[in-house]
Amino acid sequence: IWELKKDVYVVELDWYPDAPGEMVVLTCDTPEEDGITWTLDQSSEVLGSGKTLTIQVKEFGDAGQYTCHKGGEVLSHSLLLLHKKEDGIWSTDILKDQKEPKNKTFLRCEAKNYSGRFTCWWLTTISTDLTFSVKSSRGSSDPQGVTCGAATLSAERVRGDNKEYEYSVECQEDSACPAAEESLPIEVMVDAVHKLKYENYTSSFFIRDIIKPDPPKNLQLKPLKNSRQVEVSWEYPDTWSTPHSYFSLTFCVQVQGKSKREKKDRVFTDKTSATVICRKNASISVRAQDRYYSSSWSEWASVPCS
Amino acid sequence: RNLPVATPDPGMFPCLHHSQNLLRAVSNMLQKARQTLEFYPCTSEEIDHEDITKDKTSTVEACLPLELTKNESCLNSRETSFITNGSCLASRKTSFMMALCLSSIYEDLKMYQVEFKTMNAKLLMDPKRQIFLDQNMLAVIDELMQALNFNSETVPQKSSLEEPDFYKTKIKLCILLHAFRIRAVTIDRVMSYLNAS
């Protein structure tokens, strides 16, 4: 058993049929010695008396808020949560496996630049009685500070018969140098509590590996005289690290109709302009990627050919 | 020791070209190592990230773009910083700092060159003959060093008398390649910045 936060405790259980469970001793936080009784949740049934209560925790029915009273007055609470371990593996029932970039990916994180700010998100089908708490650091043995905000519900989607909820959190490394060469990864830890179930999820990464620039901005077209060719120009996104001559991007320019299966014109360039062939009912799209360290491409920025 | 916005040395462009070749060569070599050594811990997640140049050179700091010298976090590890009060730096100081930066890059290359050559000598003794260093990568390191045109003492190639542990050597190769790729990215960024300045 360990303390998650004040008056909230996590009991780690090996979860299999007829498991013996864990013996837990609760102590009432009071100077009083006599006349103390214990109850669980809203029930008025007295579970025991005395300053300590020993219980055998085997299942979710044994978890919950234990309260010690004296003469009708509440003295203190202890909330017990369960963390299940099945076949030596901690349960991952609360969050959905995003399976990208690999199986057992519950947390996904992205950074728009090298400033040390990044966003992580996760998915669940659970809509109520759900709380998250996020901690992060650079390295684990001698951790350096990363400050994370509160996790918030950022999107709701319908997937078949199910609703899916996306939560996200923003974090900022306390003292980040954009030009630094990372040797210790960022660690992100998410505590998830659903009703009386506790689970924790972790992700470890270098900022350089989770870079995904914003799309290029200010796309403009200039038709070339006596030609079907069009000069398309754009600018670096505002959120990208500066100076741009140090943090350079490379671009992919594509002309394509509405369907992905349609024919297309595609060219890669390090410049902020390119010449392509425009077709009726097609769009010109441009996306960006770090020129020197190939992490993710940005989303497309698009303008219609006409 | 930060890079100011300065008139580029006319000989900078060949360095940019060589640094692009360097990044390409080390990236290819790293990819080859990850494929060939698939049953060894050779991915970014599996290895310890060591920097053989730590405390010996200070390329990131010496080559910091002027725009980043206002960032306290970039100056943390530096004993000296050449920020002046708002105005541009005198050209003498400019070329002095650029020289500091480029000589730091040169020293990095020299250290990695020695490590790689020593390692290759060990890998050539491996009866499995599983992996060797790409001669192209070693040649590209050499070309960039020549383009930088610094004279410095030759570092003797380390020779060891004991029987090499090939498993450890291959893991060391992965560690070295990952670190060198990261440094090659920095070098490429620096050359691009200098070329544009």
Epitope: R261, E262, K263, D265, V267, F268, I277, R279 | -
Partner: antibody, heavy 118, light 107 residues
Framework: QVQLVQSGAEVKKPGSSVKVSCKAS????????LHWVRQAPGQGLEWMGW????????EYAPKFQGRVTITADESTSTAYMELSSLRSEDTAVYYC???????????WGQGTLVTVSS | DIVMTQSPLSLPVTPGEPASISCRAS??????LHWYQQKPGQAPRQLIA???QSISGVPSRFSGSGSGTDFTLTISSLQPEDFATYYC?????????FGQGTKVEIK
């Protein structure tokens, strides 16, 4: 299976014209760009131009501008390349080729040998 | 026009050995570079798109690398069926241009 079948070999006199055809099967004809590339005996590949069969748009290499005409007939899924004012150095195998991507080629025809000789 | 220069023009290789062909562009073309293989009496066949993207159906022993002006096609272990002429082609700008070809011959 995508296939491009070209017309047979031709022998032409200098100053005349040649029209080579290329019939496509497998896939929708207008879903692809069609290119013409030639190869002189023992020489390398030389790009001549492309056509978008959907709208008839064409682009020619400056070297052939004014001498080459690429057309397409959607009803028969056939593309044509006509080269005029032939000279001996136009002796080559002429390939039609196609791709959904404009700037490179993934499927080639078998080639048509055009010999220009007096 | 962008001029593509291949080297060597002829490359004698022992079967089972690796081979590398170089292609250089007269100006920077990013990764807009494609590789083709041509056997005598046959049409070319696509091997690599955009400098390093493998094409389905092409054996994994063929790989490409490079960007800017310098590109390489590598065959990790030459098989008897790989003896052919190899061409690079730039797609950075029109007109599309090819290298002059590299003939890989049995040593």
């Amino acid at each position: 299976q995508v296939q491009l079948v070209q017309s047979g070999a031709e022998v032409k006199k200098p100053g005349s014209s040649v029209k080579v055809s290329c019939k496509a099967s497998g896939g929708t004809f207008s879903d692809y760009y069609l290119h013409w590339v030639r190869q002189a005996p023992g020489q390398g590949l030389e790009w001549m131009g492309w056509i978008d069969p959907e709208n008839g748009d064409t682009e020619y290499a400056p070297k052939f501008q004014g001498r080459v005409t690429i057309t397409a007939d959607e009803s028969t899924s056939t593309a044509y390349m006509e080269l005029s004012s032939l000279r001996s150095e136009d002796t080559a195998v002429y390939y039609c080729a196609r791709n959904k991507e404009l700037r490179y080629i993934d499927v080639w025809g078998q080639g048509t040998l055009v010999t220009v000789s007096s | 026009d962008i001029v593509m220069t291949q080297s060597p023009l002829s490359l004698p290789v022992t079967p089972g050995e690796p081979a590398s062909i170089s292609c250089r562009a007269s100006q920077s073309i990013s990764i807009n570079l494609h590789w083709y293989q041509q056997k005598p009496g046959q049409a070319p066949r696509q091997l690599i798109a955009f400098a390093s993207q493998s094409i389905s159906g092409v054996p994994s022993r063929f790989s490409g690398s490079g960007s800017g002006t310098d590109f390489t096609l590598t065959i990790s272990s030459l098989q008897p069926e790989d003896f052919a002429t190899y061409y690079c082609q730039q797609s950075n700008s029109f007109p599309l241009t090819f290298g002059q070809g590299t003939k890989v011959e049995i040593k």
